[in-house]
């Protein structure tokens, strides 16, 4: 029994005065606690605790379940203990078959002995199977067998406590070890869509998937820059061992414009945290925004091809698209397609393919698109560049020589005089009158220019050249005339086209 110096409180003394006591099943247990300030006896085995306020603990007929630690405590909180084994050949183990262990921690197989004198107290695998090679354990007859540093691989391991009694191996009831994994990585989080675009009043629903080794991972939806608790619903699954999945679904049944913002799915475990965000944009009504991919004023050479291309954003989805020219709708020659196959795509492309354009096909080409909320349109002004064409070249009654040419851009007309038989007309002649005429054709068509010179200025035989040109090309017409005596012969016009 402990001894202390006089004047200091001392622990109680127990009779019999030994740390361990072995009794046979059916015998009496009689324990006496001597202390002037006796408070209570406490009995503990496995997770059991019982109390007794009498200073003498008497169990008339001991049973195996009376095996355990008996502690006497005084009013100073000082205590003394004795451990009693109730030897019962029919019940060598007291057990609590609950067996849960955390990875990398120790866990106790609770199978304390009722007889400390049996030998080879250890663990054995069920049905004769060997235990994992790396499994280490420490037996303690009063508590059970401590498995050291539990491994994930021990999950669902079936085992027995075992002793040798009179040369024979005796097994306890079986235990199934459930291993709770340690977190060795952050949770894996993903979101059903990275962005959402909705009209006011529509339902917003987004699902975050959290994957981890166990269900003790924490997760929540948060609104960035807000502390408001969001309403979420959970579904979860164990896809086999150490493969847990949770789906956290956030719903706003009728979204408003001020619900727009960034929502974060946050998850953490003891290793660390992870998050993923989704963006919600709520608009009061749908929209269409058109972006021309080429200049809306287009110049194209006669006979060439041009593609009129627009990109447009449409929400909700576009319902009707058309290309129009001169109040006529194209039934072919155009295509319309989404910019990406992403399900949240709102961007589309429309292309009108104009081939081998003629000078008469210039004009306004209009793209129209609509959805359930709005209509939108964009116009392209197409100008077809054409080489000048000399429409008329005449000597008028007043003696003027007149040349009329059409083309786009507007042609310039120059006049040249070639004396005698020279082929090259280099001496330029200034026109008397130049006019741009209103074309009777459609707008964007060829521009008509009329130029006149006074033929009375020419005193010698020769040729007069009318040359019409623009950025695309040039064309010439010629007037031949000769003098007979003092009279000017009939002028014979002819043309020579220069490519």
């Amino acid at each position: 029994q402990p001894s202390v110096s006089p004047g200091e409180p001392s622990p109680p003394s127990i009779h019999p005065g030994k740390s361990d006591l072995i009794v046979r099943v059916g015998d009496e247990i009689r324990l006496l606690c001597t202390d002037p300030g006796f408070v209570k006896w406490t009995f503990e085995i496995l997770d059991e605790t019982n109390e007794n306020k009498q200073n003498e603990w008497i169990t008339e007929k001991a049973e195996a379940t009376n095996t355990g630690k008996y502690t006497c405590t005084n009013k100073h909180g000082l205590s003394n203990s004795i451990y009693v084994f109730v030897r019962d050949p029919a019940k060598l183990f007291l057990v609590d078959r609950s067996l849960y262990g955390k990875e990398d921690n120790d866990t106790l197989v609770r199978c304390p002995l009722t007889d400390p004198e049996v030998t080879n107290y250890s663990l054995k695998g069920c049905q004769g199977k060997p235990l994992p090679k790396d499994l280490r354990f420490i037996p303690d007859p009063k508590a059970g067998i401590m498995i050291k540093s539990v491994k994930r691989a021990y999950h669902r391991l079936c085992l027995h406590c075992s002793v040798d009694q009179e040369g024979k191996s005796v097994l306890s009831e079986k235990f199934i070890l459930k291993v709770r994994p340690a977190f060795k990585a952050v949770p894996v989080v993903s979101v059903s869509k990275a962005s959402y675009l909705l009209r006011e009043g529509e339902e917003f629903t987004v699902t975050c998937t959290i994957k981890d080794v166990s269900s003790s991972v924490y997760s929540t939806w948060k609104r960035e820059n807000s502390q408001t608790k969001l309403q979420e619903k959970y579904n979860s699954w164990h896809h086999g061992d150490f493969n847990y999945e949770r789906q956290a679904t956030l719903t706003i049944s009728s979204a408003r414009v001020n619900d727009s913002g960034v929502f974060m799915c946050y998850a953490n475990n003891t290793f660390g945290s992870a998050n993923v965000t989704t963006t919600l944009e709520v608009v009061d009504k749908g929209f269409i925004n058109i972006f021309p991919m080429i200049n809306t004023t287009v110049f194209v050479n006669d006979g060439e091809n041009v593609d009129l291309i627009v990109e447009y954003e449409a929400f909700p989805k576009p319902e009707h698209q058309q290309w129009i020219y001169m109040n006529r709708t194209f039934t072919d020659k155009w295509e319309d397609y989404p910019k990406s196959e992403n399900e949240s795509n709102i961007r589309y492309v429309s292309e009108l393919h104009l081939t081998r354009l003629k000078g008469t096909e210039g004009g306004t080409y209009t793209f129209l698109v609509s959805n359930s909320d709005v209509n939108a349109a964009i116009a392209f002004n197409v100008y077809v560049n054409t080489k000048p064409e000399i429409l008329t070249y005449d000597r008028l009654v007043n003696g003027m020589l007149q040349c009329v040419a059409a083309g786009f851009p507007e042609p310039t007309i120059d006049w040249y005089f070639c004396p005698g038989t020279e082929q090259r007309c280099s001496a330029s002649v200034l026109p008397v009158d130049v006019q741009t005429l209103n074309s009777s054709g459609p707008p964007f068509g060829k521009l008509v220019v009329q130029s006149s010179i006074d033929s009375s200025a020419f005193k010698h035989n020769g040729t007069v050249e009318c040359k019409a040109y623009n950025d695309v090309g040039k064309t010439s017409a010629y007037f031949n005339f000769a003098f007979k005596g003092n009279n000017k012969e009939q002028i014979h016009p002819h043309t020579l086209f220069t490519p």
Epitope: I45, L46, D47, E48, T49, N50, T65, L94, V95, D96, R97, S98, L99, Y100, K102, H155, R156, E173, I176, K178, V179, R180, P181, S214, S215, S216, D241
Partner: nanobody
């Protein structure tokens, strides 16, 4: 064959009481600490209470402490849960199960768990 059969559930008004019972057979009942767990509609499994093999030690989730009492009768292989001052949030399917994990996580589940009995707390 192991069987855990719960009874005693039903509809009760807020503030009312119920006593759940669990009859165990097919295994050594007093070899297990026992637990009550519950699962509300659309929610995960929640541990409620546990009791040691001989009944000397009891454990409760914070949400039920002071309102629920767990007990057992090893001679009859019976587990009980007395539920007082019931609230709407106690509505769930209640099951008895073998084992007690002091961490409260029950990773890997239970060796055995019953089908459960439905408790509905509503006015």
């Amino acid at each position: 064959e192991v069987q855990l059969l719960e009874s005693g559930g039903g509809l009760v008004q807020p503030g009312g009481s119920l006593r759940l019972s669990c009859a165990a057979s097919g295994f050594t009942f007093d070899s297990y600490a026992m637990s009550w767990v519950r699962q509300a509609p659309g929610e995960g499994l929640e541990w409620v209470s546990a009791i040691s093999t001989g009944g000397g030690s009891t454990y409760y989730a914070d949400s039920v402490k002071g309102r629920f009492t767990i007990s057992r009768d090893n001679s009859k292989n019976m587990l009980f849960l007395q539920m007082n001052s019931l609230r709407a949030e106690d509505t769930a399917v209640y099951s008895c199960a073998t084992g007690y994990d002091s961490s409260g996580y029950y990773y890997g589940g239970f060796d055995y768990r019953g089908q459960g009995t439905l408790v509905t707390v509503s006015s």
